[in-house]
């Protein structure tokens, strides 16, 4: 049984030309993560692997950094990365675990940060 | 090209054991989960074990548990499914697959290797 | 554990025609469906990941759809080739789960 829920930065703002940090948290659940991957829509940006540490798909090298932890940094922000970002955590025993991310990419220097919210 | 050839299946006895083989190629192996599925002689398919690529984390279906150990030698690029104390439930062709790098999906399977489990 | 349930067990087409094959999860599996395709003798073939991605080397003609409990997989217009059995697969929650297949033979 799957007991576990993801807590994300949800809804969240930056400046074009800057960075942001995308995080997600699996909670409530004793199960082990084997991998984290992170994708803009169907594209699949970088993979946390347990064993093998960090890959980032090379159309992507330039411009997104592993880290924080188990979270990715985008860099060098266009209007064109504005949308939804997921995180989706294999583990054992549980299964496959999806959070989602908005990221408004702004023109502006007002960036507000959105609050936090859980998904089940 | 990528290559998964299976071997060590065969006629055993209730209660016997086995071990099978997945020799892979054309690919870096040390960076990918493995996995055996079998596919029972009414054609349903069964993932049965599956192996991360450093060998750090395994999966075994409940009713294999304790008797079936998956396990693999990235120095060899070898697949392994030492299988004991098997059931005439177990009679099935073994499948070593591979999973793509983001772990959704199985992209490519050996031929099969059979096992019958006799009485 | 989750049970797929494919429909139909088995259907009969005429090559060009469009066939529809459906697979029903037993509960909630977001996204996580995989299809393969098995020839007779032949080790089953990847298709479709993430109900909807083409695996690579896929023919276009084939396509999926659906989230939630309710999958397809569809095949626009049917070719020699294609005449074969097909499972689902989820990938939510272990043990990941097969469906019990659907034989597409020739009308």
């Known amino acids: 049984m799957m007991t576990g829920t993801i807590e994300t930065t949800g809804n969240i703002s930056a400046e074009k030309g800057g960075s942001i940090i995308l995080q997600c948290h699996l909670s409530s659940t004793t199960a082990q993560v084997t991998q984290v991957n992170w994708e803009q829509q169907d594209q699949l940006l970088a993979i946390c692997n347990a064993d093998l540490g960090w890959h980032i798909s090379p159309s992507f090298k330039d411009r997104v950094a592993p880290g924080p932890g188990l979270g990715l940094t985008l860099q060098s922000l266009t209007v064109n990365d504005t949308g939804e970002y997921f995180c989706i955590y294999h583990t054992y025993p549980d299964g496959t675990y999806t959070g989602r991310i908005f990221l408004e990419v702004l023109e502006s220097s007002v960036a507000e940060h959105g609050a936090r919210f859980q998904i089940p | 090209d990528v290559k998964l050839v299976e071997s060590g299946g065969g006629l055993v006895k209730l209660g016997g054991s086995l071990k099978l083989s997945c020799a892979a190629s054309?690919?870096?192996?040390?960076?990918?989960?493995m996995s055996w599925v079998r596919q029972t002689p009414e054609k349903r398919l069964e993932l049965v074990a599956a192996?991360?690529?450093?060998?750090?984390?395994?999966y075994y279906l409940d009713t294999v548990k304790g008797r079936f150990t998956i396990s693999r030698d990235n120095a060899k690029n070898t697949l392994y499914l030492q299988m004991s104390s098997l059931k005439s439930e177990d009679t099935a062709l073994f499948y070593c697959?591979?999973?793509?790098?983001?772990?959704?999906?199985?992209?490519?399977w050996g031929q099969g290797t059979s096992v019958t489990v006799s009485s | 554990a989750i049970q797929m349930t494919q429909s139909p067990s088995s259907l009969s087409a005429s090559v060009g025609d469009r066939v529809t094959i459906t697979c029903q999860a037993s509960?909630?599996?977001?996204?996580?469906l995989s299809w393969y395709q098995q020839k007779p003798g032949k080790a089953p073939k990847l298709l479709i990941y993430k109900a909807s991605t083409l695996a690579s080397g896929v023919p276009s003609r084939f396509s999926g759809s659906g989230s939630g409990t309710d999958f397809t997989l569809t095949i626009s217009s049917l070719q020699p080739d294609d005449f074969a059995t097909y499972y689902c697969q989820q990938g939510q929650t272990y043990p990941f789960t097969f469906g019990g297949g659907t034989k597409v033979e020739i009308k």
């Open positions: 054309g690919f870096t192996f040390s960076s990918y989960t």
């Open positions: 509960q909630n599996i977001n996204v996580w």
């Open positions: 192996i991360s690529s450093g060998g750090s984390y395994t």
């Open positions: 697959t591979r999973w793509l790098l983001s772990l959704y999906a199985m992209d490519y």
